[in-house]
Interface confidence: medium
Amino acid sequence: KVFGRCELAAAMKRHGLDNYRGYSLGNWVCAAKFESNFNTQATNRNTDGSTDYGILQINSRWWCNDGRTPGSRNLCNIPCSALLSSDITASVNCAKKIVSDGNGMNAWVAWRNRCKGTDVQAWIRGCRL
């Protein structure tokens, strides 16, 4: 599923991401835009043999199990395929674990490079939330 901007903002808010660990909803929508272009089925391979999955591009070396990433930790205790569902529950729950890990949203390279320090509220402007 490819979400609309406001559609995703509403879904993320429903799942409790607004101000989760101090990160406003705009941060999460911005991260999703630049990680996956709002596409729940996005997958991207990394040079270390791992793969990033879903709307927030969660990595198989640390957070989920795709059955083929050497030394996978699977810290979210889920199959990576669950992160590709049109229902973003699994991605949100795992993202909450990631953002609580110490580095906050710096764990998402796209957020660090494209969202951090910008007017992230623009990503939810005009949305009926």
């Epitope: 089925q41 996005a42 997958t43 391979r45 040079t47 043999g49 795709d66 059955g67 083929r68 990433t69 050497p70 199959p79 990576c80 395929s81 669950a82 590709l84």
Partner: antibody
Framework: QVQLQESGAEVMKPGASVKISCKAT????????IEWVKQRPGHGLEWIGE????????YYNEKFKGKATFTADTSSNTAYMQLSSLTSEDSAVYYC?????????WGQGTTLTVSS | DIELTQSPATLSVTPGDSVSLSCRAS??????LHWYQQKSHESPRLLIK???QSSSGIPSRFSGSGSGTDFTLSINSVETEDFGMYFC?????????FGGGTKLEIK
């Protein structure tokens, strides 16, 4: 137990297309990558690419881009590989395998012969 | 692409002999190297995953070692059913690649 059952041997004419199937049983089909491998005598084993059935995500070996197209039907637990614009170079045995990094489960292979 | 070079291309042995097959990678692949046996007109069968982990149901005479660029598959006391082709495969990066194979034949 995990099993991959491939479609039967094919004899095709040059320029034609063929679609090979791989039916999976014994595991959750949507959650594992399906890999496709080509084997020709004297050429060893070549990785063609892979598909994640649950999302339809695909990756192709550059060498096979434009030649192979992967699809999957999660309702029938079947992965497909279509090979187009066939030439004699495409004559080979084609295997599907479950992608665990390593390939512990293989189909029995589909023999494709391209001949005029 | 990572190139895997297997040697020797052919190995002629007598049942009861112990043998070592080599697989060398063109760059470091950590332990992401797997070994397969293939008999004529059959699909490959996984023997060893991640350089040294035996696959289920594989006889204990098969063992693997190595890391980085140099890997070895050892068969302790070859049996007649072991003759065939042996391939290595890397899963360190894409595209996945295979070695050219070693043919184990009866002397």
């Amino acid at each position: 137990q995990v099993q991959l059952q491939e479609s039967g041997a094919e004899v095709m004419k040059p320029g034609a297309s063929v679609k090979i199937s791989c039916k999976a049983t014994g595991y959750t089909f949507s959650t594992y990558w399906i890999e496709w491998v080509k084997q020709r005598p004297g050429h060893g084993l070549e990785w063609i690419g892979e598909i994640l059935p649950g999302s339809g995500s695909t990756y192709y070996n550059e060498k096979f881009k434009g030649k192979a197209t992967f699809t999957a039907d999660t309702s029938s637990n079947t992965a497909y590989m279509q090979l187009s614009s066939l030439t004699s170079e495409d004559s080979a045995v084609y295997y599907c395998a479950r992608g665990d990094g390593w390939y512990g489960y293989w189909g029995q292979g589909t023999t494709l012969t391209v001949s005029s | 692409d990572i190139e895997l070079t297997q040697s020797p291309a052919t190995l002629s042995v007598t049942p009861g002999d112990s043998v070592s097959l080599s697989c060398r990678a063109s760059q470091s692949i950590s332990n992401n190297l797997h070994w397969y046996q293939q008999k004529s007109h059959e699909s490959p069968r996984l023997l060893i995953k991640y350089a040294s982990q035996s696959s289920s149901g594989i006889p204990s005479r098969f063992s693997g070692s190595g890391s980085g660029t140099d890997f070895t598959l050892s068969i302790n006391s070859v049996e007649t059913e072991d003759f065939g082709m042996y391939f290595c495969q890397q899963s360190n990066s894409w595209p996945r690649t295979f070695g050219g194979g070693t043919k184990l034949e009866i002397k």
